[in-house]
């Protein structure tokens, strides 16, 4: 009996530019002789329904149809036909199929590969054209994929130490697509510093599919207006 097992759940998520290993494990009733078996990996794009051969292994020969694609002969001996793809790109997302032949038996499995890119986040203070006592804080998130992203603003005061979401005076712009397929977006918070307590901590909170925990950039309102430190003005996260 020959069986193939892919990633549990049928989906694998990988970061952009990573060296991804797409899992494919072989279960066979006898010890595997790699000289008399075949492995073929196929890829089907998200955008068109045509299947393309990525890698082929047959006995004493292997061929990569995607540069750098490889199945380890040394892992194959112990039933691991996983495909290594170095420097994975956004356009390589889609369905991957692992086909195993141990003559006369054949088994296959499929997995969906999702490629994600994590946003970098930075805070900027924009004072241009602002009225007296009025500040505009911009939270820029860049280089993320997929497009769906959630940016919120929170504040913590000495009176209320638990974060409170700010819903007023927040404008989040449209997402902009970059040349490399990733996205950027900017969210703005308008503040009237005369009405806010010094010592209040404001946070821009970015939630995205690529992040295990939200990305947080913060600044503290000081008694002297606009006295943000340079690092607070351009708080970089990756």
């Amino acid at each position: 009996d020959l069986k193939v097992e892919m990633m549990a759940g049928g989906t694998q998520i990988t970061p952009l530019n990573d060296n991804v290993t797409i899992f494919c494990n072989i279960f066979y009733s006898q010890p595997l002789n790699i000289t008399s078996m075949g492995i073929t990996w196929f890829w089907k794009s998200l955008t068109f329904d045509k299947e393309v051969k990525v890698f082929e292994f047959f006995g004493d020969h292997q061929e990569a149809f995607r540069p750098g694609a490889i199945v380890s002969p040394w892992r194959l001996k112990s039933g691991d036909a996983s495909l290594r793809l170095p420097g994975i790109q956004l356009e390589e997302a889609g369905e991957y199929r692992c086909e195993v032949v141990v003559t006369p038996l054949k088994a296959q499995g499929t997995v969906q590969l999702e490629v994600v890119a994590s946003p970098a986040s930075r805070l900027l203070l924009d004072q241009v054209g602002m009225k007296e006592n009025e500040d505009k804080y911009m939270c820029e998130s860049s280089g993320f994929y997929p497009e769906a992203i959630n940016i919120t603003w929170e504040k913590q005061t000495q009176k209320f130490p638990h974060p409170i979401e700010i819903s007023e005076d927040v404008i989040t712009g449209p997402t902009i697509k970059n040349m490399d397929g990733t996205f950027n977006v900017t969210s703005c918070l308008k503040l009237n510093s005369s009405q806010e307590d010094p010592g209040t901590v404001y946070q821009c909170v970015v939630r995205h599919a690529s992040l295990h925990t939200p990305l947080r950039s913060n600044f503290t309102l000081t008694a002297a207006r606009h006295s943000l430190s340079e690092t607070e003005k351009t708080d970089n996260f990756s």
């Epitope: 290993t21 494990n25 380890s72 040394w74 892992r75 001996k77 112990s78």
Partner: antibody
Framework: EVQLVQSGAEVKKPGASVKVSCKAS????????MDWVRQAPGQGLEWMGD????????LYNQKFRGRVTMTVDTSISTAYMELSRLRSDDTAVYYC?????????????WGQGTTVTVSS | DIVLTQTPLSLSVTPGQPASISCKAS??????????MNWYLQKPGQPPQLLIY???TLHSGVPDRFSGSGSGTDFTLKISRVEAEDVGVYYC?????????FGQGTKLEIK
């Protein structure tokens, strides 16, 4: 920085078992196999087998089959090698070594070694 | 099993002079155009360290005075100018077939 840190020296009686651990750090544990190699006093190197942390699959040197068990705990990036029914000629330094498996096959980083002495 | 025979088993070299070690395999260690032969150096009291893999590729951080050549069954490790720090035992290893086997070792000493 890639590091493989092995457990301390062991003294065992004939017929007993020994379990050596190898804690890996500085790289993605599942991207490489772990080889186990031993060296008897004043002797050369002998490959015992390897384990694939990706699926737990093992390849053992026929010489040790039935006596050796290699396992991994991916949650703590640690590989283990257990050798049972010890004999005096199992007295050796046991090494774990990180093994590249995609672009060739070679052991590029080695643990410091664990001395196992089998004596009655 | 593939048997690897190293020659010489020991050699004594004057610093600055070249050295050469041969490794012969009982059968070919080539597969799909590549040679699966590796070279290691074991310095006294230390674990082995990788010098060369795939017959001729220098491992990162290894001085370029070391070089490897050969294919099929005949392989050579060369040191263009031996230095005091090169003392130890040199092993060839094949990784084409299991069990992966080592040569018996060549001890390099400084004159």
């Amino acid at each position: 920085e890639v590091q493989l840190v092995q457990s301390g020296a062991e003294v065992k009686k004939p017929g007993a078992s020994v379990k050596v651990s190898c804690k890996a750090s500085g790289y993605t544990f599942t991207d490489y196999n772990m080889d186990w190699v031993r060296q008897a006093p004043g002797q050369g190197l002998e490959w015992m087998g390897d384990i694939n942390p990706n699926n737990g699959g093992t390849l053992y040197n026929q010489k040790f089959r039935g006596r050796v068990t290699m396992t991994v705990d991916t949650s703590i990036s640690t590989a283990y090698m257990e050798l049972s029914r010890l004999r005096s000629d199992d007295t050796a330094v046991y090494y774990c070594a990180r093994s590249e498996v995609f672009y060739g096959n070679y052991a590029d980083y080695w643990g410091q070694g664990t001395t196992v002495t089998v004596s009655s | 099993d593939i048997v690897l025979t190293q020659t010489p088993l020991s050699l004594s070299v004057t610093p600055g002079q070249p050295a050469s070690i041969s490794c012969k395999a009982s059968q070919s260690v080539d597969y799909d155009g590549d040679s699966y032969m590796n070279w290691y150096l074991q310095k006294p009291g230390q674990p082995p360290q990788l010098l060369i893999y795939a017959a001729s590729t220098l491992h990162s951080g290894v001085p370029d005075r070391f070089s490897g050549s050969g294919s099929g069954t005949d392989f050579t490790l060369k040191i263009s100018r031996v230095e005091a720090e090169d003392v130890g035992v040199y092993y060839c290893q094949q990784s084409k077939e299991d069990p992966r086997t080592f040569g018996q070792g060549t001890k390099l000493e400084i004159k």
